[in-house]
């Protein structure tokens, strides 16, 4: 019973995070404009990985793709790169532990099978969201790092008569996103992982079994020899399943296009 | 076609208050931001800021804060402007405009006349 | 606030002639994020409204006859009447509208010799 729902669960949190991971890496805001300390301008500049925008206080929004793949940092190919991997891999663990989940049989898959692949899918749950935070994090350092090179450019470049607007990026949504869902993807796969030790079958009872006479009561009456074998049957557990109703929130709410700054 | 309609002129006394509006019509009233111009006789534009008809927020022009007050109207499709304490040095043409891509205004309405004269 | 400041206050043309109508900012008016400049250039006729004729600084609104033409980035911008009709003779306005307050120009005023 524990074990199922250790399963069951490890699959709904790993597939609220893969989702979230999803909605992370299509986001448009991992980097948005710092508005704090900064003239307030009718413009408001956001970034994701795949484009960047532009949001007039009009409300009309333009967003540009990068057309480009040679143009673009090193860094965010990378972030592009770490966040595809879980994304793939955190499907196929999705398709994996389908098949391993203990309320579902498929023919007569023995529970051996059950185990390694609920094992599998819960280390590629593991790897994904590793590979998540992993973007995520490499995102924010590099956020972190431009930061405050504008801000030391803020500062330095005063000297000059025609003063410039600074762009400054801090954290957008889609990062905040990424870190949960990764983290729960995570801790899906680690419930997925113990999950498998309760799945596997005990061969060791089989195989480990010492035979030897502590618990025998051997009697030596005038009416013969009478041995009384202590070995009891070996009976397993039988598990029942239950198989809850489980919600799943909108993971974004995207900003209207009357949101202004 | 778009129009905006603003009310007609207005004589005031000082240290008196004026409502004028600005009926929006031939496109949708909460799409778009209305912004409001003060334009004093023979001189330029100044802006004296926005109301955004969607969420009702306003944004001021530190100048006129505390003596404009930009509301709007979803029903009617209007935006109105009140202004307070008024001075000799308010009276002007005072025009509404719907704010458009690249933060333009696009469309204006005819401008309500203030004089304020005792 | 940023100080838009147009040049020359009054110009005297005659029909057909190009024109030039120069505003600087006090500020750079470049958003790095679309690469576009956000200043708009109006035209004012005695007893009427302001009508736009460009914005992005060098975007022509619909219906704006093509002899003007906007141009410049960052803080220097020009207003180009390439030429001019007896019913080009107006005020021509520059604004920013990129940094609140939004701010306007003093205004060129465009006379007939």
């Known amino acids: 019973m524990a074990v199922t729902a250790c399963q069951g669960l490890g699959f709904v949190v790993s597939l609220i995070g893969i989702a979230g991971i999803i909605a992370a890496t299509c986001m448009d805001q991992w980097s948005t404009q710092d508005l704090y300390n900064n003239p307030v301008t009718a413009v408001f500049n956001y970034q994701g990985l795949w484009r960047s925008c532009v949001r007039e206080s009009s409300g009309f929004t333009e967003c540009r793709g990068y057309f480009t793949l040679l143009g673009l940092p090193a860094m965010l190919q990378a972030v592009r790169a770490l966040m595809i991997v879980g994304i793939v891999l955190g499907a196929i663990g999705l398709l994996v532990s389908i098949f391993a989940l203990k309320c579902i049989r498929i023919g007569s898959m023995e529970d051996s099978a059950k185990a390694n692949m609920t094992l599998t899918s819960g280390i590629m749950f593991i790897v994904s969201g590793l590979c998540a935070i992993a973007g995520v994090s490499v995102f924010a350092n590099m956020l972190v790092t431009n930061f405050w090179m504008s801000t030391a450019n803020m500062y330095t470049g005063m000297g000059g008569m025609v003063q410039t607007v600074q762009t400054r990026y801090t954290f957008g949504a889609a990062l905040f996103v990424g870190w949960v869902a990764g983290g729960l993807t995570l801790i899906g796969g680690v419930m997925m992982c113990i999950a498998c030790r309760g799945l596997a079958p005990e061969e060791t009872n089989y195989k480990a079994v010492s035979y030897h006479a502590s618990g025998h009561s051997v009697a030596y009456k005038p009416g013969g020899f009478k041995a009384s074998t202590g070995f009891g049957s070996n009976t397993k557990n039988k598990k029942t399943y239950d198989g809850g109703a489980h919600t799943e929130d909108e993971l974004q709410s995207y900003p209207s296009k009357h949101d202004y700054v | 076609e778009v129009q905006l309609q603003q009310s007609g002129p207005e004589l005031v006394k000082p240290g008196a208050s004026v409502k004028m509006s600005c009926k929006a019509s031939g496109y949708t009233f909460t799409n778009y931001i209305i912004h409001w111009v003060k334009q004093k006789p023979g001189q330029g534009l100044e802006w004296i800021g926005y109301?955004?008809?969607?969420?009702?927020?306003?944004k001021y022009n530190e100048k006129f804060k505390g003596r404009a007050t930009l509301t709007s109207d979803k029903s009617s499709s209007t935006a109105y402007m009140e202004f307070s304490s008024l001075t000799s040095e308010d009276s002007a043409v005072y025009y509404c405009a719907r704010l458009n891509r690249g933060n333009a205004m696009d469309y204006w309405g005819q401008g309500t006349s203030v004089t304020v004269s005792s | 606030d940023i100080v838009m400041t147009q040049s020359p206050s009054s110009l005297t043309v005659t029909v057909r002639e190009k024109v030039t109508l120069s505003c600087k900012s006090s500020?750079?008016?470049?958003?790095?994020?679309?690469?576009?400049?956000?200043l708009t250039w109006y035209q004012q006729k005695p007893g009427q409204p302001p009508k736009l004729l460009i914005y992005?600084?060098?975007t022509r609104e619909s219906g704006v006859p093509d002899r003007f033409t906007g141009s410049g980035s960052g803080t220097d911008f020009t207003l180009t009447i390439s030429s001019v009709q007896a019913e080009d003779l107006a005020v021509y306005y520059c604004q920013n509208v990129y940094i609140y307050p939004f701010t306007f120009g003093a205004g060129t005023k465009l006379e007939l010799k």
């Open positions: 500020q750079s008016l470049l958003n790095s994020g679309n690469q576009k400049n956000y």
């Open positions: 992005w600084a060098s």
């Open positions: 109301i955004n008809p969607y969420t009702d927020g306003p």
